[in-house]
């Protein structure tokens, strides 16, 4: 079971995680963003829930997707180059969930855009982190 | 046939101290999240506590401090540790199966908590 | 957290009629909605998930339908075994909240 320590490092992750969702969300809202009506084309699978630390398996399902779709912003949108953000959300994705590798997400009927997506998984971030224990 | 059945249920005094159980049987009772959900007297239904497979815990901030779900796998039982009890905490205690992807699929008999000095 | 609200707390209806419990979220929750029925004295019993969908053993009288922010239950053909109290939940984001229940009267 969790201890108090590793409980307090997965805050840190998922607080860690939130602030780089938040990052990549602000970079493609920009209103200097010329290709964000591109980018919005972009159809990402959402999860049919997203409650639990497992389902984050959902969200790393995604993120090739996601970075494909970073590729066609302006770079200067962002502090790190698409592939070294996915990187270290990738990372932190892969502590957070676990090693349940037997665990399949399974997605939503609808896709959504890229704002869609990642509203979806910041408040995820933002309720995980208000009622972990 | 999946069965949830709760017992520790009892009358208590405001700041005191109970724990609940729920045993289940007939399904991977480790592969699943399992929550508390209690009935108040108005018949209002609130989200106590979850704990997943992981056995990490989720709870709301009116119970978060007071309240610690856990559970035991090789027993297949399901436990909520409730002090400093407030007499807002009257109500019914049910035990549930969170299904993977959809909504508490399974709920146990209930047991009874009364806080009242 | 996300208010769930029922607005109708008691409906009254007659057995063969058509009978529609409403629910509405306060914010965006996709199809992340539960339907629970609590006949008297007993514990609630889960009628439909992912807003349209029944779980096994469940009647096809009883009809979820809905996305977003408005849920709505359908119970066609309302037989006398239907009195019961009836609760939406979302399961969209922790933590979970439930609406506050209509109680369906047989006439």
């Known amino acids: 079971a969790p201890t108090s320590s590793s409980t307090k490092k997965t805050q840190l992750q998922l607080e860690h995680l939130l602030l780089d969702l938040q990052m990549i969300l602000n970079g493609i809202n920009n209103y200097k963003n010329p290709k964000l009506t591109r980018m919005l084309t972009f159809k990402f699978y959402m999860p049919k829930k997203a409650t639990e630390l497992k389902h984050l398996q959902c969200l790393e399902e995604e993120l090739k997707p996601l970075e494909e779709v970073l590729n066609l912003a302006q770079s200067k949108n962002f502090h790190l180059r698409p592939r070294d953000l996915i990187s270290n959300i990738n990372v932190i994705v892969l502590e957070l969930k676990g090693s349940e590798t037997t665990f399949m997400c399974e997605y939503a009927d609808e896709t959504a855009t890229i704002v869609e997506f990642l509203n979806r998984w910041i408040t995820f971030c933002q309720s995980i982190i208000s009622t972990l224990t | 046939d999946v069965r949830l059945v709760e017992s520790g249920g009892g009358l208590v005094k405001p700041g005191g101290s109970l724990k609940l159980s729920c045993a289940a049987y007939g399904f991977t009772f480790s592969s699943y999240t399992l929550a508390w959900v209690r009935q108040t007297p108005e018949k209002r239904l609130e989200w106590v506590a979850a704990i997943d497979s992981s056995s990490y815990t989720y709870s709301p901030d009116t119970v978060r401090g007071r309240f610690t779900i856990s559970r035991d796998n090789a027993k297949n039982t399901l436990y909520l540790q409730m002090s400093s009890l407030k007499s807002e905490d009257t109500a019914m205690y049910y035990c549930?199966?969170?299904?993977?992807?959809?909504?508490?699929?399974?709920w146990g008999q209930g047991t009874s908590v009364i806080v009242s000095s | 957290d996300i208010v769930m609200t029922q607005s109708q707390k008691f409906m009254s209806t007659s057995v063969g009629d058509r009978v529609s419990v409403t629910c509405k979220a306060s914010?965006?929750?996709?199809?992340?909605v539960g339907w629970y029925q609590q006949k008297p004295g007993q514990s609630p019993k889960a009628l439909i998930y992912s807003a349209s969908f029944r779980y096994s053993g469940v009647p096809d009288r009883f009809t979820g339908s809905g996305s977003g922010t408005d849920f709505s239950l359908t119970i066609s053909n309302v037989k006398s075994e239907d009195l019961a109290e009836y609760f939406c939940?979302?399961?969209?984001?922790?933590?979970?909240?439930f609406g506050g229940g209509t109680k369906l009267e047989i006439k």
């Open positions: 549930t199966r969170d299904s993977n992807w959809d909504a508490l699929d399974y």
């Open positions: 939940q979302q399961y969209y984001t922790y933590p979970y909240t």
């Open positions: 914010q965006n929750v996709g199809t992340n």
